[in-house]
């Protein structure tokens, strides 16, 4: 048996992937266990192995198909169940009536690249990952750059209200190392949150031309 | 603005058909789920059946195998074909679409349309 608290949080990434985290207190030493899918309406259920991401959190990602394809809507309602093995048995340990659109986060944006780069200034762009084509171009962004010498969470956040897929970094300085992230965010849901950060874009900015004022 | 338009309510006797029809029409939306819903006087709003997109069907209880659900999510059109009317089927019947308009999702309901089944 397993005491102590159980926290168990779920996301829909808007397409054909639900991500799950399961925490509890209790040991849990070598027990096998798994988060079940079963959709209210649908005639697929689905199921994952939940591997260790800390000593006492596991993790899982429900895979429903085709990357891009559209699995869940708005009156979907998913039973998801963590199941852990008790003997020959299974035992269940959480269980949430899921409501994918209310409980949205979205894949990190992806393919950021340098457009153009000066001595002060650099344009970069990316791409959003599997976003449902529910939202058109109604999602929010946001942006931070890492200076020399700061933290990412001293870096303000610049904020994008709009599916705009590119910003343009001023008042940079010249000839210096910079990294950059960007995350995504739809409008609807109640429990939807940020994506995760994307992978940070390391870009330089060009040397001020000698002799010239700058 | 979006609006929904019933049509196809009337009077028919036990163990008769009707088919309803509603379209979805107004400013740029997405649909995501459209379906029938009714109401009987002293009674709550009652699922009677939807549709969402990936061709999902549900149900209520009552109509299993007498009522059929038919979706066109191009032409944002959904009707219900009734069959094997019994008296309990008599109400108002209210078309729901699920809509989304700027990045969010509401729902949207018909006038109604009445349905009245006599023994």
């Known amino acids: 048996a397993v005491n102590g608290t159980s926290q168990f949080t779920c996301f829909y990434n808007s397409r054909a992937n639900i991500s799950c985290v399961w925490s509890q207190d209790g040991a849990l030493q070598d027990t096998s266990c798994q988060v079940h899918a079963w959709p209210d309406r649908r005639r697929w259920n689905q199921t994952c192995e939940l591997l260790p991401v800390s000593q006492a959190s596991w993790a899982c990602n429900l895979i429903l198909g085709a990357p891009d394809s559209q699995k869940l809507t708005t009156v979907d309602i998913v039973t998801l169940r963590v199941l852990c093995r008790e003997g020959v048995r299974w035992r269940v340990m959480a269980i949430q009536d899921f409501k994918p659109f209310e409980n949205l986060r979205l894949m990190a944006p992806i393919s950021l690249q340098v457009v153009h780069v000066e001595t002060h200034r650099c344009n970069i762009s990316w791409e959003i990952s599997q976003a449902s084509h529910y939202f058109e171009r109604h999602l929010e962004f946001e942006a931070r750059t890492l200076s020399p010498g700061h933290t990412w969470e001293e870096a303000p956040l610049l904020t994008l209200k709009q599916k705009q897929e590119w910003i343009c970094l001023e008042t940079l300085t010249p000839d210096t190392q910079y990294e950059f992230q960007v995350r995504v965010k739809p409008l609807q849901g109640e429990f939807t949150t940020w994506s995760p950060w994307s992978q940070p874009l390391a870009f330089r900015t060009k040397p001020a031309a000698l002799g010239k004022d700058t | 603005e979006v609006q929904l338009v019933e049509s196809g309510g009337g009077s028919v006797q036990t163990g008769g058909s009707l088919r309803l029809s509603c379209v979805v029409s107004?400013?740029?939306?997405?649909?995501?789920?459209m379906g029938w819903y009714r109401q009987v006087p002293g009674k709550q709003r009652e699922l009677v059946a939807d549709m969402a997109d990936g061709g999902s069907a549900k149900y209520g209880d009552s109509v299993k195998g007498r009522f059929t659900i038919l979706r066109d999510s191009v032409k944002n059109t959904v009707t219900l074909q009734m069959s094997s009317l019994n008296p309990e089927d008599t109400g108002v019947y209210y078309c729901k679409a699920g809509l989304w308009i700027t990045g969010r999702h509401s729902d949207y309901w018909g006038q109604g349309t009445q349905v009245t089944v006599t023994s």
């Open positions: 107004g400013s740029h939306f997405i649909s995501d789920v």
